[in-house]
Interface confidence: low
Amino acid sequence: EPPTACREKQYLINSQCCSLCQPGQKLVSDCTEFTETECLPCSESEFLDTWNRETRCHQHKYCDPNLGLRVQQKGTSETDTICTCEEGLHCMSESCESCVPHRSCLPGFGVKQIATGVSDTICEPCPVGFFSNVSSAFEKCRPWTSCETKDLVVQQAGTNKTDVVCGPQDRQR
């Protein structure tokens, strides 16, 4: 009696169980009563990552430099190419189809966490006693200058965007 279900790594066709092609290979012809399934390796720029009965291999992903992408891991006959973003960019989405520039933290904000290839810059407001006067993707909030340690006095208070201004102490004679 012809089978109605097949074992793992097999598929049912014409009332018989044929072996699936292994990862990295595509189906050329189904098995028959007398012949095994015929499979062929994927070409250099293609892959198949599962046991399959596909007649075409999938094209490796193209890491398009015009989208800010570069190859992180070259594809094989069994795996797709993995793209990552160029320096200064991070992936738009999990699939990393394109990249966007890291955002800069504006004056008054410092970098809490530097961006990576997959996550954007995280900024934080500069707390009292700290400032940032630049728009930067790397700089943290910097502490106000300590006038006392320089034997000077505060002439102008600092803000979250500006450092304190120190000046000489008025000496009483």
Epitope: N66, G68, M92, P101
Partner: antibody, heavy 120, light 107 residues
């Protein structure tokens, strides 16, 4: 509102070159690719190529066989398209159009167009 | 190069009616198709990208669908300002290629 402002109309003789400029107002080109598209009278739109301001990388439509050169001046937020060895069939409106990386090559902002007439 | 073929060449529709425009790619372009509207003397305007994502500010009456080789732009209820030429673009592979356009005219 993002605006791309292109240079004015040009009349050129066959064999000459033309250089069209495209200035971005409100934003710099960072995070965008700049495409160039042309449209001959009554014809479909035709993509000529693009430049990535981040790294200066260019990709051209092979149809133009080295006749087109795309450049960018980031400090002036201006992109340029130069087409050489002009012939009468190059008479067209030339557009610059930008694509944000999150919409790969789906050109979302367009210049007003520059009419280039090639006539002897 | 990938050839994009639009149909019909001209579509005559009455205001308030539905318009369905078709675009076929000569090979698989996945969902990398954009739709543009162009009026005489104006630059094209992006309506839809990635086959079905409506650009910010585009009215909800415009919708896109499809994947692979067959794509559709639907305008659910035509307004007077929608009469124009519509182009599809594949942004899957170089060179990027446009369809020849569909002119939507008043019936």
């Amino acid at each position: 509102q993002v605006q791309l402002v292109q240079s004015g109309a040009e009349v050129k003789k066959p064999g000459a070159s033309v250089k069209v400029s495209c200035k971005a107002s409100v934003y710099s080109f960072t995070g965008y690719t700049v495409n160039w598209v042309r449209q001959a009278p009554g014809q479909r739109l035709e993509w000529m190529g693009l430049i990535n301001p981040l790294n200066g990388g260019t990709t051209y439509n092979q149809k133009f066989k080295g006749r087109v050169t795309l450049t960018i001046d980031k400090s002036a937020s201006t992109a340029y398209m130069e087409l050489s060895s002009l012939r009468s069939e190059d008479t067209a409106v030339y557009y610059c159009a930008s694509s944000y990386y999150s919409t790969p090559y789906a050109m979302d902002y367009w210049g007003q167009g520059t009419l280039v007439t090639v006539s002897s | 190069e990938i050839v994009m073929t639009q149909s019909p060449a001209t579509l005559s529709v009455s205001p308030g009616e539905r318009a369905t425009l078709s675009c076929k790619a000569s090979q698989n372009v996945h969902t990398r198709v954009a739709w543009y509207q162009q009026k005489p003397g104006q630059a094209p305007r992006l309506l839809i990208y990635l086959a079905s994502d409506r650009r910010t500010g585009i009215p909800a009456r415009f919708s896109g669908s499809g994947s692979g080789t067959e794509f559709t732009l639907t305008i659910s209820s035509l307004q007077s300002e929608d009469f124009a030429v519509y182009y599809c673009l594949q942004h899957w592979n170089y060179p990027l290629t446009f369809g020849q356009g569909t002119k939507v005219e008043i019936k």
